[in-house]
């Protein structure tokens, strides 16, 4: 039969940042197509990316329904042009993905410093509350909405003239730090979820320095 050339998908990998979640796999198809199914541990299978020649499938819409659930996906392989055909056991070939729990495993996206304001020897640094694709009551939730106090930010700040980075932490999106009068400082933030065992930290935000446009200085 024509199924003998169909190969099972392998290296199924979840790629997820701020809940935007894509399943990737190999190999690039030769005379075959793929369909993906996703399910929670207790739920029914839902098919996505029907008969595709891609080696990735965006499953964001499914996982954002409940980011605390654990999901399993599987990738079915079919002969191109003969998708009704099945393998020798009467089933199309398929491979299971690793389990994936978005709340625990999605990578934290690179944060952005929204603004900073100096008032005397205090600086208030505000982190942008990034929007996710998780919805509640028809509105998109921010990262803070989803993670609450589980999400903290670490601020690295240093004098423009030196390299040593002091740190501050917040479980809101604002920092208030003490600085030396007359010194210019640079800032970078990192998102952290301390309760996690993997993917605990984000990459650092772009560096912002005093004396640039984002900041405001007020002498008291």
């Amino acid at each position: 039969s024509g199924t003998t050339n169909t190969v099972a998908a392998y290296n199924l990998t979840w790629k997820s940042t701020n809940f935007k979640t894509i399943l990737e796999w190999e190999p690039k198809p030769v005379n075959q197509v793929y369909t993906v199914q996703i399910s929670t541990k207790s739920g029914d299978w839902k098919s996505k990316c029907f008969y595709t020649t891609d080696t990735e499938c965006d499953l964001t819409d499914e996982i954002v329904k409940d980011v605390k659930q654990t999901y399993l996906a599987r990738v079915f392989s079919y002969p191109a042009g003969n998708v009704e055909s099945t393998g020798s056991a009467g089933e199309p070939l398929y491979e299971n993905s690793p389990e994936f729990t978005p709340y625990l495993e999605t990578n934290l996206g690179q944060p952005t410093i929204q603004s900073f304001e100096q008032v005397g020897t205090k600086v208030n640094v505000t982190v942008e509350d990034e929007r996710t694709l998780v919805r509640r009551n028809n509105t998109f939730l921010s990262l803070r909405d989803v993670f609450g106090k589980d999400l903290i930010y670490t601020l690295y700040y240093w004098k423009s003239s030196s390299s040593g980075k002091k740190t501050a932490k917040t479980n809101t999106n604002e920092f208030l730090i003490d600085v030396d009068k007359g010194e210019n400082y640079c800032f970078s933030v990192q998102a952290v979820i301390p309760s996690r065992t993997v993917n605990r930290k984000s990459t650092d935000s772009p560096v912002e320095c005093m004396g640039q446009e984002k900041g405001e200085f007020r002498e008291i």
């Epitope: 903290i152 390299s163 932490k169 479980n171 301390p194 996690r196």
Partner: antibody, heavy 121, light 107 residues
Framework: EVQLVESGGGLVQPGGSLRLSCAAS????????IHWVRQAPGKGLEWVGY????????YYADSVKGRFTISADTPKNTAYLQMNSLRAEDTAVYYC??????????????WGQGTLVTVSS | DIQMTQSPSSLSASVGDRVTITCRAS??????VAWYQQKPGKAPKLLIY???FLYSGVPSRFSGSRSGTDFTLTISSLQPEDFATYYC?????????FGQGTKVEIK
């Protein structure tokens, strides 16, 4: 099991150099922060510096700034303390410690066994 | 830098005694204070974090509290294995700083 093991201590002459290692097992250092702390004989604990192995950020105590450098090799899951221009007052047991957060409060939950550095002619 | 002033520097007590060690921060440190126990020739061990949270595996006779910038470590009933040196530490700002230590000795 989480473990930190320091090595590299020993006797060195004033002005000399030494590199201490802090090998971690049971966790990935890039997910945490590593601090170095020292304790001179019969004295209290003195913070030396930290590194965030994920991004390389460091900060040092004034007493060692410009002489000591902290680095990390994440594939080897090891942090290092490079000590140059050593002085007699740097004689101490050196510890590395893992820092984690509870909410926004930091705590140092695992410490190495310590390695003795003696600076003497 | 924030100073952590610890008192007393040493104390003598008997098994079963209630022991209190205090630390005063030179400025507000919120709850960012931890307490460590150290025995001779050993590394410090975490007892209390976030001013009042008992670290996993630490006996419940240890407790921590905060009143403004004053922090207290209490051992409700001193046991033979509790004779050691205790340090407070703040990590509200960089650099983190330790108290000078309190040596708890057998009376």
């Amino acid at each position: 099991e989480v473990q930190l093991v320091e090595s590299g201590g020993g006797l060195v002459q004033p002005g000399g150099s030494l590199r201490l290692s802090c090998a971690a097992s049971g966790f990935t250092i890039s997910g945490y922060w590593i601090h170095w702390v020292r304790q001179a004989p019969g004295k209290g604990l003195e913070w030396v510096g930290y590194i965030d192995p994920y991004n390389g950020a460091t900060y040092y105590a004034d007493s060692v700034k410009g002489r000591f450098t902290i680095s990390a090799d994440t594939p080897k899951n090891t942090a290092y303390l490079q000590m140059n221009s050593l002085r007699a007052e740097d004689t101490a047991v050196y510890y590395c410690a893992r820092a984690d957060y509870h909410g926004v409060d930091e705590y140092w939950d695992y410490w190495g066994q310590g390695t003795l550095v003696t600076v003497s002619s | 830098d924030i100073q952590m002033t610890q008192s007393p520097s040493s104390l003598s007590a008997s098994v079963g005694d209630r022991v209190t060690i205090t630390c005063r921060a030179s400025q507000d440190v919120n709850t960012a204070v931890a307490w460590y126990q150290q025995k001779p020739g050993k590394a410090p061990k975490l007892l209390i974090y976030s001013a009042s949270f008992l670290y996993s595996g630490v006996p419940s006779r240890f407790s921590g509290s905060r009143s403004g910038t004053d922090f207290t470590l209490t051992i409700s009933s001193l046991q033979p294995e509790d004779f050691a040196t205790y340090y407070c530490q703040q990590h509200y700002t960089t650099p983190p700083t330790f108290g000078q230590g309190t040596k708890v000795e057998i009376k």
